[in-house]
Interface confidence: low
C-alpha cells in the first residue's frame, strides 16, 4: 500500500526534486493573424540533444496535450501553420506558430522527453484582438524609449492656419501640441512640431523618449473650421521582448546593448528588475556598481554608435532574472529611457566545474589558483587578468600561456598548462597586500568559461623559508636552501628556474630534516638547489615549491645574481631583499635582514664562541651583512683576547656578541654554502611561521567552495595546522632583556673564552 502511495506521489509531483534546466519565454504576446517564434533552451548533453522535444498545451486538469513534437507529430489544430526545429549544437529548439487566433491564448509547455516528466518550461501565450482602426489610419509601431515622427498632410488653404495634434482619451480628444506653442505637460521636453518648407504641404510631430502611456489614437489637424484637414494615427509603443539568455552556473554572460546613435552621449546602464517595476542598477557609465557584482563585472567601452556590452562572470543562481540596458542622464531606468531586455536563466546543471572563488595567502607567501576552461579548447590561449573597479571596470592582462608576463610581475607570476584536461594553474608569489583583489581566468576560446577568483591576504607567515636575494660567483658552486615544514612531508618538493613561459624544474638535494621549525619533527625538510660552475645564464629567479602530481601548492622565490670574483672583503651573500615592497612581510625582517648583524662573523654562531676578532671589531668592518671578512674562515691565533685585551673590553665585546648570537636562539642554525665561505644563518625566527595560518592553496581554501587535494586537509590549513602541535608563542624579549641574559650567559662561560677563541671557530 505504501509503495502504491509513493508511486502516486511521484506521478503527481514528477519534478519536485530539482529545478528543471529547460528554459524559454515566460510570456509571449501577439496579435491575431500574426506569427510567433518560441525558443526553448536545454543543456546540450548527448542525451538531451537526441531526445524527443515537444510543445504541449496545458489542460484545466493538469495534463498536457501534445500539439507538435520533434518526432514528426503535428496536431490537427496546428496542421499547416506550425513547425518545431531542433538545433542540437546550440541546445535549443524553436516552435513557430502562424495565423494566430485568440483561441491560441493559453498555458503551454516546451520540454524534453515525456510530457509529464518535468523536464519542461511553462509558457503563457496571449493573443489579442487587432486594433479596431478608423479608415485611413496610419499605424506607427515604435519601441519604448525611442522616437516617433507622426506626419500630417494638409491642403494649401490650410497652410497658414493653426496646426495641432490631439490624443483620443476615452471619448474626448486632448490637445497634445499646437503651432501656437502649446505643449501638454505630459509631453514637456520631449515633443516638437515641425512645419516643412512652403513647398511641402506637411507638418510633423516628433515625440522622443516614448512611454508606454503614449500609446493610443492620435488626430492631427490643420485648421479649426469645417475645412480643416484631419489625419488619424495609431501609435503602438512596444515593450521590448526580452531576449532569452541561457548560461551555466559559474560561467559568464555578455549583454550587448545597442540603443542607437541618438543616445551615444547619454549615460548608459544595466539594471536588474526586482519586484514590480523597480530596476536596480547593476552597473552604469557614471561609476555605479552593485556590490553583489564587485569583481565580476565589466562595462566595455562604448562604440561611436553608443553601443556597449556588459560582461558578468562567476554566475550565481541569484543572478537569474530580467535585465534591462538603457540610456538616461541619471544612469538609471526612467520613464522614456530607450531600453533593451534580456531574461537570464542560470542553468544549475553546469558544465563548468566548481573551483574556489576565494583563495587566501599571506604577505610574502604565494597562492596557486586553479582555472577551469573548456576542455574541448585545450589549444586555446589562456589568460589571467586583474579586475580593476575604476570607472566601469576593466581587466588588464597579467600573463598568458604564450609567454607574456606583465613586467611588474616578472619572477613572481607563472601560468602553467598543468594539470591540463580542463584546468590550468596560475601561481603568484612574493605576495603583498596590494595583490589582494579579483582576478579573472579566461581563454581566447569559449567566452562563457570566464571565471573569477578573489585573492585575500591574511595574517601569517609563509610556510617555505628561503634566503633573500643571493649573489653567486662566476665559475663557482652555489647552494641555496629551502626549508619545508613537516606539514608538507607527503608532497613532492622541487626547485625550478622561472622564465616567462613557466618554471623549468631543476635537480635538488634533500638534506634531511630542517632545523628551521622548532615545533616540527623529523618530517620537516631542507632541500637545496645546487648550481655548479655558475655562469651568467644562471642569473634569475628561482622558485622552490611543493606539489602533488600536477597540483601545485606553495612556492617561494629567490633572486640569484651572478658576479665576478672580487678581492677580499667583497660581498658574500645578499640576504637583504632590496626590492621588497614597503609593506612586504617577506618571511620575517629578522631573516630577510639577518638583523643586519646576525652574520657579522660566522664564529659568533659556534656554540660557545663568544668573542670576535678584535681587529675586525676595531676597524668597524662588521656594520652590515655585506661587509664580512673573507680572510680568516679558519679562525686564527690573532684573536689573542686573553692576553692582549683588557678583561673589561672582553666582557663588553662578549656581551654584545653573545647578545646578538643568543638572541637569535643559537641552536637553530642552518648553513648556506656560497663561494668558499660558510655562512651560518639563524633560523630561530621561523618558528610558529603559521601563527594565524594561511591557506596553502593546494587544492583550495576552507572558504565558500572547499576542495582539498587527495583528501589531505592539512594542505588547506586556513586557520590552523592540523599536523603540527604548536608551542605557545614565546613573548619577544626586549633588546635590554636579551642583552642582560646574554651577559649572564657570557659570565658563566668566561673561563673558557680565551682558549676557545684561540682554537678558532668550531661547527655549530
Amino acid at each position: 500500500m505504501l509503495l502504491f502511495v509513493l508511486t502516486c506521489l511521484l506521478a503527481v509531483f514528477p519534478a519536485i526534486s530539482t529545478k528543471s534546466p529547460i528554459f524559454g519565454p515566460e510570456e509571449v504576446n501577439s496579435v491575431e493573424g500574426n506569427s510567433v517564434s518560441i525558443t526553448c533552451y536545454y543543456p546540450p548533453t548527448s542525451v538531451n540533444r537526441h531526445t524527443r522535444k515537444y510543445w504541449c498545451r496545458q489542460g484545466a486538469r493538469g495534463g498536457c496535450i501534445t500539439l507538435i513534437s520533434s518526432e514528426g507529430y503535428v496536431s490537427s489544430k496546428y496542421a499547416g501553420r506550425a513547425n518545431l526545429t531542433n538545433f542540437p549544437e546550440n541546445g535549443t529548439f524553436v516552435v513557430n506558430i502562424a495565423q494566430l487566433s485568440q483561441d491560441d491564448s493559453g498555458r503551454y509547455k516546451c520540454g524534453l522527453g515525456i510530457n509529464s516528466r518535468g523536464l519542461s518550461f511553462d509558457v503563457s501565450l496571449e493573443v489579442s484582438q487587432g486594433p479596431g482602426l478608423l479608415n485611413d489610419t496610419k499605424v506607427y509601431t515604435v519601441d519604448l524609449g525611442r522616437t516617433v515622427t507622426i506626419n500630417c498632410p494638409f491642403k494649401t488653404e490650410n497652410a497658414q492656419k493653426r496646426k495641432s495634434l490631439y490624443k483620443q482619451i476615452g471619448l474626448y480628444p486632448v490637445l497634445v501640441i499646437d503651432s501656437s506653442g502649446y505643449v501638454n505637460p505630459n509631453y514637456t521636453g520631449r515633443i516638437r512640431l515641425d512645419i516643412q518648407g512652403t513647398g511641402q504641404l506637411l507638418f510633423s510631430v516628433v515625440i522622443n523618449q516614448l512611454r508606454l502611456s503614449d500609446a493610443g489614437q492620435y488626430l492631427c489637424q490643420a485648421g479649426d473650421d469645417s475645412n480643416s484637414n484631419k489625419k488619424n494615427a495609431d501609435l503602438q509603443v512596444l515593450k521590448p521582448e526580452p531576449e532569452l539568455v541561457y548560461e551555466d552556473l559559474r560561467g559568464s554572460v555578455t549583454f550587448h546593448c545597442a540603443l542607437g546613435p541618438e543616445v551615444a552621449n547619454v549615460a548608459k546602464f544595466l539594471c536588474r528588475q526586482s519586484s514590480g517595476e523597480n530596476c536596480d542598477v547593476v552597473v552604469n557609465t557614471l561609476g555605479k556598481r552593485a556590490p553583489a557584482f564587485e569583481g565580476r563585472i565589466l562595462l566595455n567601452p562604448q562604440d561611436k554608435d553608443g553601443s556597449f556590452s556588459v560582461v558578468i562572470t562567476g554566475l550565481r543562481k541569484e543572478d537569474a532574472g530580467r535585465y534591462l540596458c538603457g540610456a538616461h542622464s541619471d544612469g538609471q531606468l526612467q520613464e522614456g529611457s530607450p531600453i533593451q531586455a534580456w531574461q537570464l536563466f542560470v542553468n544549475e546543471e553546469s558544465t563548468i566545474p566548481r573551483s574556489p572563488t576565494v583563495v587566501k595567502g599571506v604577505a610574502g607567501g604565494s597562492v596557486a589558483v586553479l582555472c577551469p576552461y573548456n576542455r574541448k579548447e585545450s589549444k586555446s590561449i589562456k589568460y589571467w587578468c586583474l579586475w580593476e573597479g575604476a570607472q566601469n571596470g576593466r581587466c588588464p592582462l597579467l600573463v598568458d600561456s604564450e609567454g607574456w608576463v606583465k613586467a611588474q610581475y616578472e619572477g613572481r607570476l607563472s601560468l602553467l598548462e598543468e594539470p591540463g584536461n580542463g584546468t590550468f594553474t596560475v601561481i603568484l608569489n612574493q605576495l603583498t597586500s596590494r595583490d589582494a583583489g579579483f582576478y579573472w581566468c579566461l581563454t581566447n576560446g569559449d567566452t562563457l568559461w570566464r571565471t573569477t577568483v578573489e585573492i585575500k591576504i591574511i595574517e601569517g607567515e609563509p610556510n617555505l623559508k628561503v634566503p633573500g636575494n643571493v649573489t653567486a660567483v662566476l665559475g663557482e658552486t652555489l647552494k641555496v636552501p629551502c626549508h619545508f615544514p613537516c606539514k608538507f612531508s607527503s608532497y613532492e618538493k622541487y626547485w625550478c628556474k622561472w622564465n616567462n613561459t613557466g618554471c623549468q624544474a631543476l635537480p635538488s638535494q634533500d638534506e634531511g630534516p630542517s632545523k628551521a621549525f622548532v615545533n616540527c619533527d623529523e618530517n620537516s625538510r631542507l632541500v637545496s638547489l645546487t648550481l655548479n660552475l655558475v655562469t651568467r645564464a644562471d642569473e634569475g629567479w628561482y622558485w622552490c615549491g611543493v606539489k602533488q602530481g600536477h597540483f601545485y601548492g606553495e612556492t617561494a622565490a629567490v633572486y640569484v645574481a651572478v658576479e665576478e670574483r672580487k678581492a677580499a672583503g667583497s660581498r658574500d651573500v645578499s640576504l637583504a631583499k632590496a626590492d621588497a615592497a614597503p609593506d612586504e612581510k617577506v618571511l620575517d625582517s629578522g631573516f630577510r635582514e639577518i638583523e643586519n648583524k646576525a652574520i657579522q662573523d660566522p664564529r659568533l654562531f659556534a656554540e660557545e664562541k663568544a668573542v670576535a676578532d678584535t681587529r675586525d671589531q676595531a676597524d668597524g668592518s662588521r656594520a652590515s651583512v655585506d661587509s664580512g671578512s673573507s680572510e680568516e674562515q679558519g679562525g686564527s691565533s690573532r684573536a689573542l683576547v686573553s692576553t692582549l685585551v683588557p678583561l673589561g673590553l672582553v666582557l663588553a665585546v662578549g656581551a654584545v656578541a653573545v647578545g646578538v648570537a643568543r638572541a637569535r636562539h643559537r641552536k637553530n642554525v642552518d648553513r648556506v654554502s656560497i663561494r668558499s665561505y660558510r655562512t651560518d644563518i639563524s633560523m630561530s625566527d621561523f618558528e610558529n611561521s603559521r601563527e594565524f595560518g594561511a591557506n596553502d592553496n593546494m587544492g583550495a581554501s576552507s572558504i565558500t567552495q572547499e576542495t582539498s587535494l587527495g583528501g589531505k586537509e592539512e594542505f588547506v590549513a586556513t586557520t590552523e595546522s592540523t599536523t603540527e602541535t604548536k608551542e605557545p608563542k614565546k613573548a619577544k624579549r626586549s633588546s635590554k632583556e636579551e642583552a642582560e641574559m646574554a651577559y649572564k650567559d657570557f659570565l658563566l662561560q668566561s673561563s673558557t673564552v680565551a682558549a676557545e677563541a684561540q682554537d678558532g671557530p668550531q661547527e655549530a
Epitope: 566595455n300 560582461v311 579566461l442 581566447n444 567566452t447
Partner: nanobody
C-alpha cells in the same frame, strides 16, 4: 575592424634571408599584440614571433636568434626579418593582430604569404 595586408614572401635559398611586412589599417590603435604565425606542410598553424604594445617581443624557440621582429613608430606595421633560413621554415606565414577588449581577445588575420626555402 582591422585589416591586415602582408607582403614580402617568396623564394629563398637555405641560409638566405627574407623580410615579411604586415600593415594594419582600420581600428589599429587598439591592437595589443601583432605578430606572425606560420603553417608548414603537414602541420597546424604555429606561433613564430610577436610584439606587444609595450614593445616586448617573443619568438618561438625554433626561430630565436635567426628572426627579428620590429615595428614602425606608428605601431601599425610590423616587419619580420628572417635570416639563416632553413628548409623547415617553408610554409604560409600569417600576420596576426590581437585586440584585448577588456574581457576577451579578438584575433584578426591576414591572407597569408608563402615562404619557400630551397636547400
Amino acid at each position: 575592424q582591422v585589416q591586415l595586408v602582408e607582403s614580402g614572401g617568396g623564394l629563398a635559398q637555405a641560409g638566405g634571408s627574407l623580410t615579411l611586412s604586415c600593415a594594419a589599417s582600420g581600428t589599429a590603435a587598439g591592437i595589443d599584440v601583432m605578430g606572425w604565425y606560420r603553417q608548414t606542410p603537414g602541420n597546424s598553424r604555429e606561433f613564430v614571433a610577436r610584439i606587444f604594445s609595450n614593445d616586448v617581443t617573443h619568438y618561438a624557440d625554433s626561430v630565436t636568434g635567426r628572426f627579428t621582429l620590429s615595428r614602425t613608430q606608428d605601431k601599425n606595421t610590423v616587419s619580420l626579418q628572417m635570416n639563416s633560413l632553413k628548409p623547415d621554415d617553408t610554409g604560409v606565414y600569417y600576420c596576426n593582430a590581437r585586440i584585448w577588449t577588456g574581457s576577451t581577445t579578438v584575433d584578426y588575420w591576414g591572407q597569408g604569404t608563402q615562404v619557400t626555402v630551397s636547400s
